[in-house]
């Protein structure tokens, strides 16, 4: 009679993660009498996955009934499988023995590999914010993908880029892999809704990339211009001087009147308007009492834009062409919430 | 066919010892294991122990542990288990069995007994 | 050991009656128990092994069940052939032991 055999008829089994493996395993005879074992990997390290005879293993499930007698079949099936169970699979048939079974003969190996989706793209942006015609450098991350083969591409605004740098790791043979791209993006002014997208494409998303995006808006800062004017005369002794604070990105702003060099009124931006491109404009306005000053008043503009350092602007006006007015009444006309009267 | 042919009945005074001899035929004798079964008069079943007929490998019950000894001869394709120094208690029915369960120990094929007489 | 304690000891039965026999294993042996038929003068016969497979040429009024510690003998429909005595046995690990047995007899 021929020795027994043990037959695994498949060399390599390729599951999607989350789907269950069949493993096949079969003998050529009942003898010698004894149970099938199933193992990952070989030598004295190899995991048992499953036992005829004990233990409890959730995941497996055998094709045919094992307690049967006349039962040659020891295929097995492991459910849910994730990228940590990929490696190769021995069908193996011990003999009855004591005090414990003896192994008898093992199977070729069965190569399971598994596919796993990449998680979606976390794109993260320079933790502070840059101004326009700087370069500013982008992260993509995606994890837990198997097989290693993968494509990564940086948009900005659906204009591919060029300039990025991608690790997939780890190099050698893994489980599942990860990819760390780093793309460098030079802002404009008008990157306000810009975005920045990380697509990446795999064989098991079917041509359907993942994409992870970036809105440039947490990235950039647009500092404002500013002008001061000096509008008509709005009676006889008023002059009405407006600050404007034009294209500016975010909408943090704090401003400051100085007259002659002393705090006059500080405000914050409140009622914006916004511009196409995303950025904003604001206007502070000051009523100054002209019959109060005997000589030129230096009016000085001071935006403190999103924690940076002040810029200002100023504007000399000229008192000489208004003499004040023996006995007159110097307090000037409140307004309006903006107004500022100077004595 | 398949089966299992045991020898005689044996009579012993104590303090003797036995050799039951148990001849499988109809099927590849080396493939499977043979335990040993006795049963007294009037009694229940007990176990005795095992014997791997592919590689002489052995397990006795602890009772019995130092007295009993089995082997198998498998050009003959046949098992024996010797008994030594013989006790009135050990007159029982002696059986082979063929031990058929992959993972787990039944025995689907037994032989007829030998009846073992222990007595002065 | 394993201790295996069958019951009850005996059964008193009609032809044509429903029988169970119960045995309670002293620690889990997974499905691994066999039943045995013995009828005065003979050898035992094999009916049921791994708790609920019947061995083959046995009637099908012949039924086991249960697992770990608790397992059951069904005759469904007592035939004159089947008074005898039931033995079960556990096969999960040496040393192999029996139950004390069941005796069917004629009520």
């Known amino acids: 009679e021929e020795e027994l055999q043990v037959i695994q008829p498949d060399k390599s089994v390729l599951v999607a993660a989350g789907e269950t493996a069949t493993l096949r395993c079969t003998a050529t005879s009942l003898i010698p009498v004894g149970p099938i074992q199933w193992f990952r990997g070989a030598g004295p390290g190899r995991e048992l996955i499953y036992n005829q005879k004990e233990g409890h293993f959730p995941r497996v499930t055998t094709v045919s009934d094992l307690t049967k007698r006349n039962n040659m079949d020891f295929s097995i099936r492991i459910g849910n499988i994730t990228p940590a169970d990929a490696g190769t699979y021995y069908c193996v048939k011990f003999r009855k023995g004591s005090p414990d079974d003896v192994e008898f003969k093992s199977g070729a190996g069965t190569e399971l590999s598994v596919r796993a989706k990449p998680s979606a793209p976390v794109v993260s942006g320079p933790a502070a914010r840059a101004t326009p015609q700087h370069t500013v450098s982008f992260t993509c991350e995606s994890h837990g993908f198997s097989p290693r083969d993968i494509t990564l591409k940086w948009f900005k605004n659906g204009n591919e880029l060029s300039d990025f740098q991608t690790n997939v790791d780890p190099v050698g043979e893994s489980v599942s892999y990860s990819i760390h791209s780093t793309a460098k993006v030079v802002l404009t002014r008008e990157d306000v809704h810009s975005q920045v997208i990380c697509e990446v494409a795999h064989v098991t998303l079917q041509g359907d990339p993942l994409r992870g995006t970036a809105n440039l808006s947490e990235t950039i800062r647009v500092p404002p211009t500013l002008e001061v004017t000096q509008q008509p005369v709005r009676a006889e002794n008023q002059v009405n001087v407006t600050c404007q604070v034009r294209k500016f990105y975010p909408q943090r702003l704090q401003l400051t009147w100085l007259e002659n060099g002393n705090v006059s009124r500080t405000e914050t931006a409140s009622t914006v308007t916004e511009n196409k491109d995303g950025t904003y404009n604001w206007m502070s306005w000051l009523l100054v009492n002209v019959s109060a000053h005997r000589d030129d008043v230096k009016l000085t503009c001071q935006v403190e834009h999103d924690g940076q350092p002040a810029v200002s602007k100023s504007h000399d006006l000229k008192v000489s062409a208004h003499p004040k007015e023996q006995g007159s009444n110097t307090a000037a006309e409140n307004t309006g919430s903006n107004e500022r009267n100077i004595y | 066919q398949v089966q299992l042919v045991q020898s005689g009945a044996e009579v012993k005074k104590p303090g003797a010892s036995v050799k039951v001899s148990c001849k499988a035929s109809?099927?590849?004798?080396?493939?499977?294991?043979i335990s040993w079964v006795r049963q007294a008069p009037g009694q229940g079943l007990e176990w005795m122990g095992w014997?791997?007929?592919?590689?002489?490998?052995?397990n006795y019950a602890q009772k019995l542990q130092g007295r009993v000894t089995m082997t198998t001869d498998t050009s003959t394709s046949t098992a024996y288990m010797e008994l030594r120094s013989l006790r009135s208690d050990d007159t029982a029915v002696y059986y082979c069995?063929?031990?058929?369960?992959?993972?787990?120990?039944?025995?689907?094929?037994w032989g007829r007994g030998t009846l073992v007489t222990v007595s002065s | 050991d394993i201790q295996m304690t069958q019951s009850p000891s005996s059964v008193s039965a009609s032809v044509g009656d429903r029988v169970t026999i119960t045995c309670r294993a002293s620690?889990?042996?997974?499905?691994?128990l066999a039943w045995y038929q013995q009828k005065p003068g003979k050898a035992p016969k094999l009916l049921i092994y791994?708790?609920?497979n019947l061995q083959s040429g046995v009637p099908s009024r012949f039924s086991g069940s249960g697992s770990g510690t608790d397992f059951t003998l069904t005759i469904s429909s007592l035939q004159p052939e089947d008074f005898a005595t039931y033995y079960c046995?556990?096969?999960?690990?040496?040393?192999?032991?029996f139950g004390g047995g069941t005796k069917v007899e004629i009520k």
């Open positions: 109809g099927y590849t004798f080396h493939g499977y294991g």
């Open positions: 014997i791997s007929a592919y590689s002489g490998e052995t």
């Open positions: 791994a708790a609920s």
């Open positions: 069995a063929r031990e058929a369960g992959s993972s787990w120990y039944d025995f689907d094929l």
């Open positions: 046995q556990q096969g999960a690990s040496f040393p192999i032991t």
């Open positions: 620690q889990g042996i997974s499905s691994w």
